[in-house]
Interface confidence: medium
């Protein structure tokens, strides 16, 4: 047991030695006067009046009594509906934002350590962002019959509608429905138009062939709170086989009538290949030849993004009201309560300061809404059938179907660089800047009001 005790004593001694060397004995406890040219330690601040390094208050607290040469900062808990998110020395906690409006949901409650965060409820999008959450929500537009969704709404962008092209229709008022192909009739009772499907006589109809169009299962978005069908092909893994010239089913998801013939085709083809392979194996083994390996590959070529999606013309504008990235903390001002966060960029991280978890506020539309050329969803499906025979007269036949899909869309996910956190240096202890709607609306692009005036030169057709 003695060696254990010796080791323990040595370890304790080493820790004490390291601590003593890391902090000179005379500045081990706050308040203390910093050595010339040095800065205060982590979770300490320099008090101008006392000219000492003093303790900061922890998140959820504020400075009740400032330090002196002989006494340290006295902290107190934030009152109800107020908070501090960082280590600080503010005389009063910040007020939590006002209650979420009826078109919003509270995604983060107001606590002593964090502000309330409001986001838009399903069916609405954020028209005006703030550093965290949303300042102003607006209802997603709805496309009336004859018009389908060209670009779905996201958390931060509105729906864009487009007229249904010839051969397609939409008979609903919806913020999610896309134009669907008319059914093809053996005998047409009533021809379809942009707002109505074709009506067939009693014989069974088939769905029209939309060139290059492939109906894919839609992924469930984990990013947006309102999941909606998108007009772009999904990038979710699929077990179904894709045929380049296969019929396009109605987009409302009734794929039952589509899956059966595809399954039959694939099954019969696979069975045929298998039989041919077995026959070949038997023939080859009988004529005592080397094992034969037949490798068949069936590939579906990359679908051109525009074909798979339906051509999206210049209407695919980015109509975001983007809040400028704001890296400053909610504790920049000791005075106030109401959203005094100001955009501060590219300022060096002060040493010994805890970074805020706030990050940058981004008005991003996610993968479905990246740059106009960035909708390059690629679908690559490979079917490989291997048929091999072995020399011991027992044929081994394996078939492998691999389905791979890639998405070239990129969703903006830049991380805040050089985040400036306040209260790191004595000269910026109490700074107050106001985040105004003017600064939020710094973008040169305008979001059209719901009912706008057409540009000059536009004339009815």
């Amino acid at each position: 047991m003695a060696p254990v005790a010796v080791w323990a004593a040595l370890a304790v001694g080493l820790e004490l030695w390291a601590a003593a060397h890391a902090l000179p004995a005379q500045v081990a406890f706050t308040p203390y006067a910093p050595e010339p040219g040095s800065t205060c330690r982590l979770r300490e601040y320099y008090d101008q009046t006392a000219q000492m390094c003093c303790s900061k208050c922890s998140p959820g607290q504020h400075a009740k009594v400032f330090c002196t040469k002989t006494s340290d900062t006295v902290c107190d808990s934030c009152e109800d509906s107020t908070y501090t998110q960082l280590w600080n020395w503010v005389p009063e906690c910040l007020s939590c934002g006002s209650r979420c409006s009826s078109d919003q949901v509270e995604t983060q409650a107001c606590t002593r350590e964090q502000n309330r965060i409001c986001t838009c409820r399903p069916g609405w999008y954020c028209a005006l962002s703030k550093q965290e959450g949303c300042r102003l929500c607006a209802p997603l537009r709805k496309c009336r019959p004859g018009f389908g969704v060209a670009r779905p709404g996201t958390e931060t962008s509105d729906v864009v509608c487009k007229p249904c092209a010839p051969g397609t229709f939409s008979n609903t008022t919806s913020s999610t429905d896309i134009c669907r192909p008319h059914q093809i009739c053996n005998v047409v009772a009533i021809p379809g138009n942009a707002s109505m499907d074709a009506v067939c006589t009693s014989t069974s109809p088939t769905r029209s062939m939309a060139p290059g169009a492939v109906h894919l299962p839609q992924p469930v978005s984990t990013r947006s709170q309102h999941t909606q069908p998108t007009p772009e092909p999904s990038t979710a893994p699929s077990t179904s086989f894709l045929l380049p010239m296969g019929p396009s089913p109605p987009a409302e998801g009734s794929t039952g009538d589509f899956a059966l013939p595809v399954g039959l085709i694939v099954g019969v083809t696979a069975l045929g290949l298998l039989i041919i392979g077995v026959v070949n194996c038997v023939i080859m083994t009988q004529v005592k030849k080397k094992p034969l390996c037949l490798q068949r590959e069936a590939k579906v070529p990359h679908l051109p993004a525009d074909k798979a999606r339906g051509t999206q013309g210049p209407e695919q504008q980015h109509l975001l009201i983007t809040a400028p990235s704001s890296s400053s903390s909610s504790l920049e001002s000791s005075a106030s309560a109401l959203d005094r966060r100001a955009p501060t960029r590219n300022q060096p991280q002060a040493p010994g300061v805890e970074a805020s978890g706030a990050g940058e506020a981004r008005a991003s539309t996610g993968s479905s809404d990246s740059s106009p050329g960035g909708h390059g969803t690629q679908v690559n499906v490979t079917c490989i059938v291997n048929v091999c025979s072995s020399s011991d007269h027992s044929s081994q036949c394996s078939s492998q179907a691999s389905s791979t899909m890639g998405d070239t869309d990129s969703s903006p996910s830049e991380s805040p660089k050089d985040e400036q956190v306040p209260f790191s240096k004595e000269e910026c202890a109490f700074r107050s800047q106001l985040e105004t709607p003017e600064t939020l609306l710094g973008s040169t692009e305008e979001k059209p009001l719901p009912l706008g005036v057409p540009d000059a030169g536009m004339k009815p057709s």
């Epitope: 009826s102 069916g123 209802p139 537009r141 709805k142 496309c143 009336r144 019959p145 004859g146 018009f147 060209a150 864009v160 509608c161 487009k162 007229p163 008979n171 609903t172 008022t173 919806s174 942009a194 707002s195 109505m196 013309g313 210049p314 209407e315 504008q317 109509l319 059209p448 009001l449 719901p450 009912l451 706008g452 005036v453 057409p454 540009d455 536009m458 009815p460 057709s461």
Partner: antibody
């Protein structure tokens, strides 16, 4: 201010036709659609159809298909509704209403949205009697 | 076509009372339901769009709720000028249809 002014009352014989006008003012006519709604005496409202004032596209109620025609004259910002082969049960007050609208932008004709019938005409009484 | 039914057909209320009118759709229409007010010998007036969205210029005592098949129009504190017939209207799919109306009378 935004308003829709309709033509005066009409008395027609069964089998005849009637054409009701609806003149828009106070807004850009081609930025919106016009719906037509009728109300038989002591009855509720019945949607007859809609016309896209920008390009003239129409949707008609199935029961009126073949008898009704909706048109617009963009030069005078006027919408028209013609009903043919009139019957006694076509006796009603006919209303036009501004319905939906386009978003602004260079390609505004590609963005159509539904906003509800927010502005109504004063109504035109059509009486069908022999 | 989508059939809308309203209840009650008629409601006689005293001023400052709370009035509730319901509208039921024969199939789900999401939030594509609008409420109109029509006073005697006047044109209808849009009160609420898309089930719950208020219209500028309409008094705040009018509110709407619901989605799918069941919808409600509420008049929080009835005033004499609210005597009218109230219609629900669906724009979910063609043909657009109206409910039969609910007449509200002031005692």
């Amino acid at each position: 201010q935004v308003q829709l002014v309709q033509s005066g009352p009409e008395v027609k014989k069964p089998g005849a036709s009637v054409k009701v006008s609806c003149k828009a003012s106070g807004y850009t006519f081609t930025n919106y659609g016009i719906s037509w709604v009728r109300q038989a005496p002591g009855q509720g409202l019945e949607w007859m159809g809609w016309i896209n004032a920008y390009n003239g596209n129409t949707n008609y109620a199935q029961k009126l298909q073949g008898r009704v025609t909706m048109t617009t004259d963009t030069s005078t910002s006027t919408a028209y509704m013609e009903l043919r082969s009139l019957r006694s049960d076509d006796t009603a007050v006919y209303y036009c209403a501004r319905d939906g609208g386009y978003g602004s932008g260079t390609y505004h004709n590609d963005y159509y949205y539904y906003y509800g019938m927010d502005v109504w005409g004063q109504g035109t009484t059509v009486t069908v009697s022999s | 076509e989508i059939v809308l039914t309203q209840s009650p057909d008629f409601q006689s209320m005293t001023p400052e009372e709370k009035v509730t009118i319901t509208c039921r759709a024969s199939q789900s229409i999401g939030s594509n339901l609008h409420w109109y007010q029509q006073k005697p010998d006047q044109s209808p007036k849009l009160l609420i769009k898309f089930a719950s969205q208020s219209i500028s210029g309409v008094p705040s005592r009018f509110s709407g709720s619901g989605s799918g098949t069941d919808f409600t129009l509420t008049i929080n504190s009835l005033e004499a000028e609210d005597a009218a017939t109230y219609y629900c209207h669906q724009s979910s799919s063609l043909p657009f249809t109206f409910g039969p109306g609910t007449k509200v009378d002031i005692k």
